[in-house]
């Protein structure tokens, strides 16, 4: 058994039928020795007296709030989690296997530039009585600061009968050198805890490894005199890291038909320019990604031909 | 410690392309050292990363962009001196900060070249005949290290006589590679930068 | 005392279905995945399926996939396993397993797929 | 299809020291605890060792297991007839974790 905050604390749980459980000794937060009475939850029902109360733990029904009372006055309140371990593992059972970039993903995270701000992502189909709270650091075994907000809500979906639910939370890295060469990786690590189940999940990282670019930006399309071509021009993200000629961008730009079935025609390159023919009813995307550390490619940014 | 903004002549920089040859060199060899040692622990999650200039070279600090040198987290410098007369220096107005910028690059290559090259003698007496070194990738480091023209004391291959731990070894290609390669982005940025100004 | 029994085993052409089952006593069966497995006669064990505790997530082995079905009754305590377009490699015992460093198994059931 | 490899057969006379060994990776032993069963002719396998190493109540101290690295081994200290049986480990990988990973079992005969 520890103590996650105050008052609050995680009982782990060997999870198999007819396990023996844990035992656990809760001690009543006062200075008062006699007249000692126990409670769980919203229930009158005495479960003990006396300044300690041992019970075993075994299932979801021995946890929830414990209670010791003086003479109908609340002395002191236990919340006990359940943090189950089911054959060596511990249970994710309140968020969902994102399955990319691999299996057993559950946190995603992606940087915009190498300023060491970061933000990370989690999916759920649970919609009440959930509550997550978030850490990171740069390394463990001599953490260096990082600092996150609170995760909020950040979309819901439908997905066949189930609505999903996805959290965010945003994370800055206290002293963060753009150029830095990282040798120790960010961890991050997130607490959930759902009625009375606790679990958590970690995620551990280079910026370098995450960094996804904004989409280009004010592409404009140019049409040459007496030609098909035109020149498509844009600009690097204002998001993105400074100077640019140090932290350069390669594009891709691509000539896409109306149907999904038509040909692609792609050109890659390191200016922010090129000449391409621009077909009846084609549209025009450039996407870009990191020059010298091959990344994930940004969202398109796209203009139509006409 | 930082690089000026106005440096060598346009089109008077031949380190660049040397420099981006490099990174491509350098990433398809440790593509195929993840490939062939799949049985390892090879990939970046797996490894430990070290980084075999720390506390002899600065490349880092010493080739910091003009622009970073507000950022107060950049400037953990490590004071280190370097011998500084190269031929990437183009120009009359090459500053002493980019020439200890340079030189800190040659070094790290330097000891780089070193390490493969040790290292490389012992994959060759490996019985399974595993992994070798790219030729490519050492040429290229030796073409970079050419065009930057460095005098500096050739360090001596290290030899060793006890029996080598292939094991091991493979382990340690992994962990040089992965260095090396991030070494490699940020020669190939400063390079980038420096063509630029 | 934990108990599975198993029931539903037979003989059946292939191409044609069978739905096993697999029922529990003496603990929550809501609250523990539940496995099949396999073993086809004079050979191992072979992993067929998982259901997690609240029959939100379901895992199949590549052998069986979208052809078994897996599922659960957590109010009638029983466990089941959907099996159709059945070929002669699945004629094996089938065994359930709760999931757990400590696991109870069912008795078997043969399932001969023959013409 | 099986990952967890084992001798297919290894032999004893009673009160020999048998071992049975299950070569795995890094993905499967590597990063997760194993587990041995005994099935017994006819019958459904019974759990030996649970956590690489642990016994559960019941089954004789002569069964003992250990993990190193990326294989795993069960050891019959003083074999005895009743111990005839086949022997399978199970683990599983760290990508398709809940998927139970069999070995491809071995038969323990005891001689005389």
């Known amino acids: 058994i520890w103590e996650l905050k105050k008052d609050v604390y995680v009982v782990e749980l060997d999870w198999y039928p007819d396990a023996p459980g844990e035992m656990v000794v809760l001690t009543c937060d006062t200075p008062e020795e006699d007249g000692i009475t126990w409670t769980l939850d919203q229930s009158s029902e005495v479960l003990g007296s006396g300044k300690t109360l041992t019970i075993q733990v075994k299932e979801f029904g021995d946890a929830g709030q414990y209670t010791c009372h003086k003479g109908g006055e609340v002395l002191s309140h236990s919340l006990l989690l359940l943090h189950k371990k089911e054959d060596g593992i511990w249970s994710t059972d309140i968020l969902k296997d994102q399955k990319e970039p691999k299996n057993k993903t559950f946190l995603r995270c992606e940087a915009k530039n190498y300023s060491g701000r970061f933000t990370c992502w989690w999916l759920t189909t649970i919609s009440t009585d959930l509550t997550f709270s978030v850490k990171s650091s740069r390394g463990s075994s001599d953490p260096q600061g990082v600092t996150c907000g609170a995760a909020t809500l950040s979309a819901e979906r439908v997905r066949g009968d189930n609505k999903e639910y996805e959290y965010s939370v945003e994370c800055q890295e206290d002293s963060a050198c753009p150029a830095a060469e990282e040798s120790l990786p960010i961890e991050v690590m997130v607490d959930a805890v759902h009625k009375l189940k606790y679990e958590n999940y970690t995620s551990s990282f280079f910026i370098r490894d995450i960094i996804k670019p904004d989409p280009p930006k004010n592409l404009q399309l140019k049409p040459l005199k007496n030609s098909r071509q035109v020149e498509v021009s844009w600009e690097y993200p204002d998001t993105w890291s400074t100077p640019h000629s140090y932290f350069s961008l390669t594009f891709c730009v691509q000539v896409q038909g109306k149907s999904k079935r038509e040909k692609k025609d792609r050109v890659f390159t390191d200016k922010t320019s090129a000449t391409v023919i621009c077909r009846k009813n084609a549209s025009i995307s450039v996407r870009a990604q990191d020059r010298y550390y091959s990344s994930s490619w940004s969202e398109w940014a796209s203009v139509p031909c006409s | 410690r930082n690089l000026p903004v106005a440096t060598p002549d346009p089109g008077m920089f031949p380190c660049l392309h040397h420099s981006q040859n490099l990174l491509r060199a350098v990433s398809n060899m440790l593509q195929k050292a993840r490939q062939t040692l799949e049985f390892y622990p090879c990939t970046s999650e797996e490894i430990d990363h070290e980084d075999i200039t720390k506390d002899k070279t600065s490349t880092v600090e010493a080739c910091l962009p003009l622009e970073l040198t507000k950022n107060e987290s950049c400037l953990n410098s490590r004071e280190t001196s370097f011998i500084t007369n190269g031929s990437c220096l183009a120009s009359r107005k090459t500053s002493f900060m980019m020439a200890l910028c340079l030189s800190s690059i040659y070094e790290d290559l330097k000891m780089y070249q070193v390490e493969f090259k040790t290292m490389n003698a012992k994959l060759l007496m490996d019985p399974k005949r595993q992994i070798f070194l790219d030729q490519n990738m050492l040429a290229v480091i030796d073409e970079l290290m050419q065009a930057l023209n460095f005098n500096s004391e050739t360090v001596p291959q290290k030899s060793s006589l006890e029996e080598p731990d292939f094991y091991k070894t493979k382990i340690k290609l992994c962990i040089l590679l992965h260095a090396f390669r991030i070494r490699a982005v940020t020669i190939d940025r400063v390079m980038s930068y420096l063509n630029a100004s | 005392q934990v108990q599975l029994v198993q029931s539903g085993g037979g003989v059946v052409q292939p191409g044609r279905s069978l739905r096993l089952s697999c029922a529990a006593s003496g603990f929550t069966f809501s609250s523990y995945g539940m496995h099949w497995v396999r073993q086809a006669p004079g050979k191992g064990l072979e992993w067929v399926a998982f259901?997690?505790?609240?029959?939100?997530?379901?895992y199949y082995a590549d052998s069986v996939k979208g052809r078994f079905t897996i599922s659960r009754d957590n109010s009638k305590n029983t466990l089941y396993l959907q099996m159709k377009s059945l070929r002669a490699e699945d004629t094996a015992v089938y065994y359930c397993?709760?999931?757990?460093?400590?696991?109870?198994w069912g008795q078997g059931t043969m399932v001969t797929v023959s013409s | 299809s099986y990952v967890l490899t084992q001798p297919p057969s290894v032999s004893g006379t009673p009160g020999q020291r048998v071992t049975i060994s299950c070569s795995g990776g890094r993905s499967n032993i590597g990063s997760n605890t194993v587990k041995w069963y005994q099935q017994l002719p006819g019958t459904a396998p019974k759990l030996l060792i649970y956590?690489?190493?642990q016994r559960p109540s019941g089954v004789p101290d002569r069964f003992s297991g250990s993990k190193s690295g990326t294989s795993a081994s069960l050891a019959i200290t003083g074999v005895q007839a009743e111990d005839e049986a086949d022997y399978y480990c199970q683990s599983y990988d760290r990508g398709t974790h809940p998927a139970l990973l069999f070995g491809t079992g071995t038969k323990v005969t005891v001689l005389g």
């Open positions: 259901i997690r505790y609240d029959g939100s997530n379901k």
């Open positions: 397993k709760t999931h757990g460093s400590h696991d109870n």
């Open positions: 956590c690489n190493d």
